[in-house]
Interface confidence: medium
C-alpha cells in the first residue's frame, strides 16, 4: 500500500493538510513530541503560582514547578500547595503543629508517628521532636560484654503523603 506522507514529518513539525500534507514547523507556543503528527499541541503555560522549570520547545512541552512558598502536587506538577514549616502539616484550617508522638521533617506532607524502637528490641537513644524522628539505640543485648558492634539506627521510613485540600483554592 501507499505510505502515509505524514509519516515522514519529524517531531517539531506537523503534517499540514491545507498545504498538500507537507511538513510545517510547529507555530510559536506549540510543539509535537513525535513524528507523523497532524497537529501540534499547545505549550503548557506556567502562570500564577506555577513557574517555568523548562521552557517549551518545538519538540517538548514546558515543565512547571511552583513559586516560592509552594510545592508541587500531582503528576507533572498539576497543582501547587502551600509550604508549611517542618514540624507541621497542612490541614483545611492551615498549617498545624504535629501532635505529640508525630513528626514531619519536610515543608510538605503529613506528620508521621515516631519510630517505635521497642518493636525492634532497641532503646531510644535520642528523643523525637515535632521536626525529627526518634533515634533508636542499640538493644540491651548489643551492649552486653563481648558484643562486637553496635547496630546502626533503623533507616527512616519513606515519607507518606496525603495532600489536604485548601478551602478557596
Amino acid at each position: 500500500g501507499l505510505q502515509d506522507p505524514c509519516s515522514n514529518c519529524p517531531a517539531g513539525t506537523f503534517c499540514d493538510n491545507n498545504r498538500n500534507q507537507i511538513c510545517s514547523p510547529c507555530p510559536p507556543n506549540s510543539f509535537s513530541s513525535a513524528g507523523g503528527q497532524r497537529t501540534c499541541d499547545i505549550c503548557r503555560q506556567c502562570k500564577g503560582v506555577f513557574r517555568t522549570r523548562k521552557e517549551c520547545s518545538s519538540t517538548s512541552n514546558a515543565e512547571c514547578d511552583c513559586t516560592p512558598g509552594f510545592h508541587c502536587l500531582g503528576a507533572g506538577c498539576s497543582m501547587c500547595e502551600q509550604d508549611c514549616k517542618q514540624g507541621q502539616e497542612l490541614t483545611k484550617k492551615g498549617c498545624k503543629d504535629c501532635c505529640f508522638g508525630t513528626f514531619n521533617d519536610q515543608k510538605r506532607g503529613i506528620c508521621r508517628p515516631w519510630t517505635n524502637c521497642s518493636l525492634d528490641g532497641k532503646s531510644v537513644l535520642v528523643n523525637g521532636t515535632k521536626e525529627r524522628d526518634v533515634v533508636c539505640g542499640p538493644s540491651p543485648a548489643d551492649l552486653s560484654p563481648g558484643a562486637s558492634s553496635v547496630t546502626p539506627p533503623a533507616p527512616a521510613r519513606e515519607p507518606g503523603h496525603s495532600p489536604q485540600d485548601i478551602e478557596g483554592r
Epitope: C46, K47, R51, D83, C84, K85
Partner: antibody, heavy 118, light 107 residues
Framework: QVQLQESGPGLVKPSETLSLTCTVS????????VHWIRQPPGKGLEWIGV???????DYNPSLKSRVTISVDTSKNQFSLKLSSVTAADTAVYYC????????????WGQGTLVTVSS | DIQMTQSPSSLSASVGDRVTITCRAS??????VAWYQQKPGKAPKALIY???YRDSGVPSRFSGSGSGTDFTLTISSLQPEDFATYYC?????????FGGGTKVEIK
C-alpha cells in the same frame, strides 16, 4: 470590598521594636497570603516578608534576624514586628494581599509612615 | 539576591504616546515577573503578573512581555492618569525583589 489598613505608632525610638498591624476585610484569609513591603522616603520598594494562609512565613534574609510576621485570624489582623530599629528603617510600610492562585500583590493597604528618631 | 534593573529611570512623554519600560533580571527568572504602578502618596497597584497577564480591571493599553532576563512593560497610548512611577518585581526566588522604578512624567 477588599480593604487592608495598616496601623501603628508613627514614631519609634532607635533600638526599640517597631510594631504594626494590618487589618483586612472583604476576603477570606484562607485563600490569601499577606506580604509586608516598605518604601523609604523618595526611594524604591523593599520586600520584608510574607505569611501564607497556612501560617508559614518567609522573610527577606537582610531583615530575617529582626522581623516577625504573625496573624490573628479571629481579628482578621496581621502583625509586623521589627526589632532593634535604626534611622535606616524609616519608611512607609505597606501590607498587601497575595492570592494563592497567582504570585502577585493584587491589593495593597494605603501605607503608614514610621519614623525612627530619638 | 536577584537584582532587577529598570531603564530608563525616568522619561517624559505626551498623552497618546507609546511608552516602553524595560526591566532586566540579574539571572533567569522565567516569566515570574509582575509590574506595579504607583502614584505620589499612594500605594502601588498591580498591573501585570506572570510577565504578560493583566490583573483584573487593568486597561488593555497596558501590556507586558518577556521571559528569562529581559522584560518589557508597554503603554500603547499614554493617558493623563498613567503619569506615575512603574516598578517591576521578580518572584522566581526569595527574597522577592523590585526594580528601582521608572518615573513617567508629562512632557
Amino acid at each position: 470590598q477588599v480593604q487592608l489598613q495598616e496601623s501603628g505608632p508613627g514614631l519609634v525610638k532607635p533600638s526599640e521594636t517597631l510594631s504594626l498591624t494590618c487589618t483586612v476585610s472583604g476576603f477570606s484569609l484562607i485563600s490569601y497570603g499577606v506580604h509586608w513591603i516598605r518604601q523609604p522616603p523618595g526611594k524604591g520598594l523593599e520586600w520584608i516578608g510574607v505569611i501564607w494562609s497556612g501560617g508559614s512565613t518567609d522573610y527577606n534574609p537582610s531583615l530575617k534576624s529582626r522581623v516577625t510576621i504573625s496573624v490573628d485570624t479571629s481579628k482578621n489582623q496581621f502583625s509586623l514586628k521589627l526589632s532593634s530599629v535604626t534611622a535606616a528603617d524609616t519608611a512607609v510600610y505597606y501590607c498587601a494581599r497575595n492570592p494563592l492562585t497567582a504570585t502577585v500583590m493584587d491589593y495593597w493597604g494605603q501605607g503608614t509612615l514610621v519614623t525612627v528618631s530619638s | 539576591d536577584i537584582q532587577m534593573t529598570q531603564s530608563p529611570s525616568s522619561l517624559s512623554a505626551s498623552v497618546g504616546d507609546r511608552v516602553t519600560i524595560t526591566c532586566r533580571a540579574s539571572q533567569n527568572v522565567g516569566t515570574n515577573v509582575a509590574w506595579y504602578q504607583q502614584k505620589p502618596g499612594k500605594a502601588p497597584k498591580a498591573l501585570i503578573y506572570s510577565a504578560s497577564y493583566r490583573d483584573s480591571g487593568v486597561p488593555s493599553r497596558f501590556s507586558g512581555s518577556g521571559s528569562g532576563t529581559d522584560f518589557t512593560l508597554t503603554i500603547s497610548s499614554l493617558q493623563p492618569e498613567d503619569f506615575a512611577t512603574y516598578y517591576c518585581q521578580q518572584y522566581n526566588s526569595y527574597p522577592l525583589t523590585f526594580g528601582g522604578g521608572t518615573k513617567v512624567e508629562i512632557k
